[in-house]
């Protein structure tokens, strides 16, 4: 529980939450990454916006790139080359997709504080890195990679064929994007930079979305986007490697396929390099129950890339589809062959297996009914992870290490009990060899960053602790917050709800719930937020819960693989068992209940609202999905398969929206979208609209012409405005 | 294969030492840790001591560490352990047991077939 | 020292028969390790890391657990699982400590 604060520490009185504190980011938190450089190196911006040099060891620091010089390009970012003698200054950041985005680079040489004008870069770049040593540079200029060898250097053009929407070099297309690397690049270099490693997706065949784009001019711009939706033709993605030592020679060599991956559609998932002359690729079926993991090696005398058989694992799901979200990476042991992975043990949680020949013969690491999620690092003697054990909250993450040397294996939580009552759900950031690292605490309290010895676990300094917010939280009177768990049949229900300040049990409150639902998403997690539903509780009263129902991740196979196949159907109904289940507890006014959701959230607000009940009065759906025959075909595909008669095109029809139309009748519903969303497109809501007037439904509804799925800026002030009167209108609560 | 042979049985009288012996084949006795378990007819299991056979290393169970000494002689392959002061409470089926500590293994893989000591006048 | 209580500490049960046994450590332990041992034999592993089965053991066997809560499944009992299994933990080493024992018959 999070207190209530109604009196401050001088007595006096305190205030609730305001609908501008929220849309100004009054109340913001702040965390601390450090840049590692080295084991005990970093870099971080200061609150002057100096790039900042610190020593871990000698407690050295100083200002490497002053705000000055930043700003003589108008730079945003900056990124220090492994010899230290050059930084790249990036500037005009122009937004593309999700990750994607352009920008123009200026080299700045440190040694004599000057900006390189030879050779200078081509603008807009569409992705920029420095090697993993010395200062080579690997760039993207209009879908085709570029290498320097020296920043001054004249580049060396590795490929030819890129073309806007046709053939992406080096960079992801939409959906590989969004849906597969969730990145912006998709080139790797090798441990010391000796290969450049890239994708290649070749678009030519894919179905193109085009939308309008309003913008000032007399006459809208279309967008096209080439964009696979379920069941249409896809990106064909090939992998190459070249030496950057000298490029020219061989040019890129192609890696090979796994012959049972390559036998019909398929995916490249990701690619880890283990050594310079050893990588490892995933590749993935379109139908994604079957993912294979290639380790390659370089032969010398061919120049070429060879993957043994001998050297392919294959990770099967016979209950949902591979991995959790994504099918997770491998990694490697320090003997470059063996690896570290997470995927489902014979219980089926997510644990961590230690692969050493053959996946059969996997060693599981951890194990019980909780899951491991994320391996943040190996060294020789100890292996890093987080997990959600402590405790049996599924919406925790905490930080242990695994001792792996030349002593029986033992494990340790190193953050279960550093702050106990604060934080209880934790990032962490190393440094090289772990010889250091940053603890990111989230929350339940206010986040705080701290530095540790990687060695003795000891706290070294706290790096920031958010004093500010702490102090002008003093006087705001915020909600209470609890995590508990409903047992109904079989299956556990974890909700978060956030109860008014002076919340009274004998008293009736509206419920808002708050929706996601998405596949392998959380919601229930240990962390603070202040944000429009703490409003809504803190000054309007209202009651919010969240609840995280079947299809949701970390708590096991069974919760997360029973919406295979059957989007929009579990989903809803745990939502609604959920509900009932808080009028039960009887400080809920059954007459004012409501439900809202974006984008996943928004598909499954609008189901439940559509179910018929009768327990919701009303309802907002912000960039819902209405159909998944309308939604990209890497994410639908993976856990619906095709819409295809043999496949499982009767539940694709059975689960839109649209069909339910009717059923929005009795119902206050708010449709939203942005008209630019590339993500999940206004098409969605336009067929909802449609269906709903063909039926002759009455339903509120706004666009945000241009925005795209975050309905960013402004748009999202009116947006929170616009949400505010529906619900205050919906619950009979004066303005 | 790899096996560790101990000899059947030992009859010694009250206040006597014993030395066992656990000889190794199929593999070089310095190359892994062995531990000595001791199990009292009808009873469990319960862990003396080991020795790394490459430097003479050894740990102890408080309750064997005066009871026990344990040598090695990588010459013959051979691990030992001497009893001294024995009682009754010293009868027992002695095991020698050689540690896999191999990445995440950390149990015993192969045992002795163990060697039974009475203590009697 | 950390000690193991395991139980029951005689049980029996009829072919095809679920069978599961319990191991208690006195505090937290990170894994927990298994061992099989019929009448006039030497024990031999069964299970380590908690879950995974030592070379040759049928997949009827399982193990699970964390903290101070372990155990041992047998899905589908058959005649050859007769046997005394002791559970082996490392935390706190040295001492290595077993548990007393868990024995299962045959009906």
């Known amino acids: 529980l999070r207190p209530s604060r109604v009196h401050d520490s001088e007595g006096g009185t305190t205030r609730a939450l305001t609908l501008e504190d929220i849309l100004n980011g009054t109340f913001t938190y702040k965390t601390f990454f450090p840049n590692w450089i080295s084991g005990q190196e970093y870099l971080h911006q200061s609150t002057d916006n100096d790039i900042v040099y610190y020593n871990i060891e000698t407690g050295e620091s100083y200002t490497i790139l002053s705000n000055a010089t930043m700003k003589s390009v108008n730079a945003s970012n900056y990124g220090l080359s492994p010899d230290r003698q050059f930084a790249y200054l990036e500037s005009d950041y122009s937004k593309l997709w999700r990750y994607s985005y352009t920008a123009t680079y200026h080299i700045y040489n440190l040694n004599n504080g000057e900006f390189i004008r030879r050779n200078e870069l081509p603008r807009p770049i569409q992705y920029l890195c420095w090697s993993p040593v010395g200062s080579k540079l690997a760039y993207v200029y209009q879908n085709n990679i570029y290498l320097k060898q020296r920043p001054e250097d004249p580049p060396f053009q590795i490929t030819y064929n890129g073309r806007e929407n046709k053939i992406f070099n080096g960079i992801p297309d939409w959906v590989y994007e969004e849906e597969m690397l969730a990145t912006k690049h998709a080139l790797w270099w090798s441990p010391n930079g000796k290969f450049l490693a890239y994708a290649e997706f070749n678009d030519t065949e894919i179905p193109v979305i085009a939308y309008s784009y309003y913008g000032d001019e007399q006459y809208p711009r279309t967008i096209n986007i080439p964009y696979p939706k379920a069941g249409a033709k896809n990106p064909v993605v090939r992998i190459f490697i070249i030496d950057t030592t000298y490029p020219q020679q061989t040019g890129p060599r192609e890696v090979p396929v796994p012959a049972m991956i390559a036998s019909s559609d398929y995916y490249f998932s990701w690619l880890t390099w283990v050594t310079d002359e050893r990588v490892c690729l995933q590749w993935l079926k379109r139908i994604q129950n079957v993912s294979v993991l290639s380790i390659c090696d370089f032969r010398e005398g061919w120049q070429t890339w060879d993957c043994p058989k001998a050297q392919e694992h294959i990770e099967e799901s016979r209950t949902g589809w591979a991995g959790g979200f994504f099918v997770s990476t491998p990694v490697f042991s320090y003997d470059a062959i063996s690896y570290y992975k997470i995927f489902s043990d014979k219980d089926g949680y997510k644990h961590i297996h230690y692969i050493k020949d053959t996946v059969e013969n996997a060693i599981q690491i951890t194990s019980g009914k909780w899951e491991a999620i994320n391996i943040f690092r190996v060294t020789q003697d100890s292996l890093f992870y987080s997990s959600n054990e402590f405790e049996d909250y599924p919406g925790r993450r905490n930080i242990y290490r695994i001792s792996i040397g030349s002593s029986p294996p033992s494990k340790k939580c190193i953050t279960c009990h550093l702050r106990k009552e604060r934080c209880q759900y934790y990032t962490a950031s190393f440094s090289d060899y772990a010889k250091y690292y940053a603890l990111i605490c989230y929350g339940p309290g206010l986040p705080i960053s701290t530095l540790h010895d990687g060695h003795t676990d000891q706290e070294i300094k706290i790096l920031e602790e958010n004093k500010e917010l702490e102090n002008a939280l003093k006087n705001i009177q915020l909600p209470k917050e609890e995590i508990k768990k409903l047992e109904v049949d079989d299956i556990t229900l974890w909700y978060k709800m956030m109860l008014p300040p002076r919340f009274d049990r004998s008293k009736k409150y509206p419920l808002l719930i708050q929706v996601y639902g998405g596949p392998c998403s959380q919601s229930v997690k240990s962390v603070f937020s202040i944000n429009w539903i703490s409003y809504l509780a803190s000054k309007e009263g209202i009651v919010i819960a969240l609840v995280d129902g079947r299809g949701t991740a970390y708590q096991g196979d069974k919760l997360l693989y029973a919406v295979y196949r059957k989007l929009g159907v579990y989903e809803v109904e745990d939502q609604i068992t959920a509900v009932r289940k808080f009028i039960e507890m009887g400080f809920i006014d059954e007459k004012r209940i409501a439900i809202w959701g974006w984008s996943y959230g928004g598909y499954v607000s609008s189901l439940a609202l559509a179910s018929g009940t009768g327990l919701f009065k009303c309802g907002i759906a912000v960039a819902p999905v209405s159909s998944w025959e309308y939604y990209a075909s890497i994410y639908t595909e993976r856990f619906m398969g095709l819409p295809t008669k043999n496949d499982n095109l009767e539940h694709y029809k059975n689960s839109t929206v649209m069909a339910r139309a009717e059923y929005f009748r009795n119902v206050d519903y708010l449709l939203i979208h942005g008209t630019a969303d590339d993500n999940v497109h206004f098409q969605n809501s336009a067929q909802i609209a449609k269906a709903l007037v063909n039926a002759q439904v009455d339903f509120q509804a706004m666009w945000y012409s241009d925005q795209n799925h975050g309905i960013p800026g402004l748009s999202s002030k009116h947006l929170y405005t616009r949400m505010t009167h529906f619900l205050k209108q919906c619950f009979s609560l004066s303005d | 294969q790899v096996q560790l042979q101990q000899p059947g049985a030992e009859l010694v009288k009250p206040g006597a030492s014993v030395k066992l012996s656990c000889k190794a084949s199929g593999y070089t006795i310095t190359s892994y840790s062995l531990h000595w378990v001791k199990q009292r007819p009808g009873q469990g299991l319960e862990w003396i001591g080991e020795?790394?056979?490459?430097?003479?290393?050894?740990n102890f169970s408080e309750k064997f560490e005066i009871k026990a000494t344990l040598t090695v002689d990588s010459s013959s392959n051979t691990a030992f352990m001497q009893l001294s002061r024995l009682t009754s409470e010293d009868s027992a089926v002695y095991y020698c047991t050689r540690l896999d500590d191999s990445r995440f293994h950390w149990y015993f893989d192969v045992w002795g077939a163990g060697t039974t000591v009475t203590v009697s006048s | 020292q950390i000690v193991l209580t395991q139980s029951p500490a005689l049980m029996s049960a009829s072919p095809g028969e679920k069978v599961t046994m319990t191991c208690t450590a006195s505090?937290?332990?990170?894994?927990m390790y298994w061992y099989q041992q019929k009448p006039r034999s030497s024990p031999k592993p069964w299970i380590f890391?908690?879950?995974n089965l030592a070379s040759g053991v049928p997949a009827r066997f399982s193990g699970r657990g964390s903290g101070t809560s372990f155990s041992l499944t047998i899905s589908s009992m058959e005649a050859e699982d007769a046997a005394t299994y002791y559970c082996?933990?490392?935390?706190?080493?040295?001492?290595?400590?077993f548990g007393s024992g868990t024995k299962l018959e045959i009906k």
């Open positions: 082996q933990q490392w935390s706190g080493y040295p001492p290595i400590t």
């Open positions: 505090s937290s332990v990170s894994y």
């Open positions: 890391l908690t879950s």
């Open positions: 020795i790394n056979p490459a430097n003479g290393d050894h």
